[in-house]
């Protein structure tokens, strides 16, 4: 029972994680304009992996895609690649894990096959989570480097008379979504690997020996016992584990009712 619960929970956690990785990859707010010195701004810039956006205080938002491939920074390309690899591995892992779930019966699939599939999907989830975490971390590192570089020459101009304020960027919501999602996928993968150990039938390296009792001929084969899980032919005990994933509407919070600028 515990093995099935671990496998089911691992699947649900990984599913939520991969959904989060996909969401993070698609989000526009990987980097957002730093508002530390100016919490109320008339023009707000933010950037994603695929496009950059500008939101005016009038409410008008304009997004422009990065239509060049060769002109983009190598780091951005690397982050894109890591996220896509993470999504692909995660998606394949989900597909494999569906068939590996103990609560789903497909023909006469052996438990050993399900164990192998569970392990495979678990490893895929772990790699997927690591890819997402790596991608987000690389981007975050790039932001930190650029932030301090722009801080160093915050104001440039002609003899200090005219100020050209450089736009500084800080961590966007997508980074946090990516980190959490990557972590969840990783945890889900570990849970699947743990579940695999419980699913695999214990094998011994000595042959079966027949014991002959008087009047009866019974063959005992060591290693042929399986732990009762409550699943299998007895379908009355089936439990569905709900991951409880829910999406909350994004709530925009304002620093105060009235802003003075």
């Amino acid at each position: 029972m515990a093995v099935t619960a671990c496998q089911g929970l691992g699947f649900v956690v990984s599913l939520i994680g991969i959904a989060g990785i996909i969401a993070a990859t698609c989000m526009d707010q990987w980097s957002t304009q730093d508002l530390y010195n100016n919490p109320v701004t008339a023009v707000f810039n933010y950037q994603g992996l695929w496009r950059s956006c500008v939101r005016e205080s009038s409410g008008f938002t304009e997004c422009r895609g990065y239509f060049t491939l060769l002109g983009l920074p190598a780091m951005l390309q690397a982050v894109r690649a890591l996220m896509i690899v993470g999504i692909v591995l995660g998606a394949i892992g989900l597909l494999v894990s569906i068939f590996a779930l103990k609560c789903i019966r497909i023909g006469s699939m052996e438990d050993s096959a399900k164990a192998n599939m569970t392990l495979t999907s678990g490893i895929m989830f772990i790699v997927s989570g690591l890819c997402a975490i790596a991608g987000v971390s690389v981007f975050a590192n790039m932001l930190v480097t650029n932030f301090w570089m722009s801080t160093a020459n915050m104001y440039t101009g002609m003899g200090g008379m005219v100020q050209t304020v450089q736009t500084r960027y800080t961590f966007g919501a997508a980074l946090f979504v990516g980190w959490v999602a990557g972590g969840l996928t990783l945890i889900g993968g570990v849970m699947m690997c743990i579940a695999c150990r419980g699913l695999a039938p214990e094998e011994t390296n000595y042959k079966a020996v027949s014991y002959h009792a008087s009047g009866h001929s019974v063959a005992y084969k060591p290693g042929g016992f399986k732990a009762s899980t409550g699943f299998g032919s007895n379908t009355k005990n089936k439990k569905i584990y709900d991951g409880g994933a829910r999406t909350e509407d994004e709530v925009q919070s304002y620093p105060s009712k009235h802003d003075y600028v």
Partner: antibody, heavy 118, light 113 residues
Amino acid sequence: QVQLVQSGAEVKKPGASVKVSCKASGYAFSSYWMNWVRQAPGQGLEWIGQIYPGNGDTTYNGKFKGRVTMTADKSTSTVYMELSSLRSEDTAVYFCARFVKGNAMDYWGQGTLVTVSS
Amino acid sequence: DIVMTQSPDSLAVSLGERATISCKSSQSLLNSGNQKNYLTWYQQKPGQPPKMLIYWASTRESGVPDRFSGSGSGIDFTLTISSVQAEDVAVYYCQNAYSYPFTFGQGTKLEIK
């Protein structure tokens, strides 16, 4: 068509308060910020602040801190600008103006003359 | 606050001639995110509210005659009336639309010679 109709002229004594209204029509009232701009006689334009009727969020010019209050009534598509502790230098024509892309003001009210005199 | 300075304060031009009004800001109005300059030009005729002519420094508002054009980037901007008409007599204002509080230039009065 878009129309912004403001309330009539007001004469106030120093220290008093004035509340100017601006009734909007011809567009989705709750979806656009409304700005307030004033113009002293023979002078240039000065931005006072803005309000988003959709949720009542406001942004004010620091110069008017604590003296200005902007409100909106969605049921009547009207925005209000109240200025307290009036001084003689507050004598001006007060305009409401719709805020659009480019952070520009495309439609303006006809203006409300507020005279502060003892 | 960003200070907007217009020049000249007043301008007298013959009908059909070109009129050029300059506007200088104390800080760049160019937004790096979309490479747009957040400067707006308004026309105010006597006894009337201002009318928006140009936004994003060079984008003409619909319904505005094409003799009006805006140019410039960063801190230096220009409003050009290619062929001045009698109805163009007004005061012209530039406005910083990039940073709060929004600020206006002192205005340039256009007259007919």
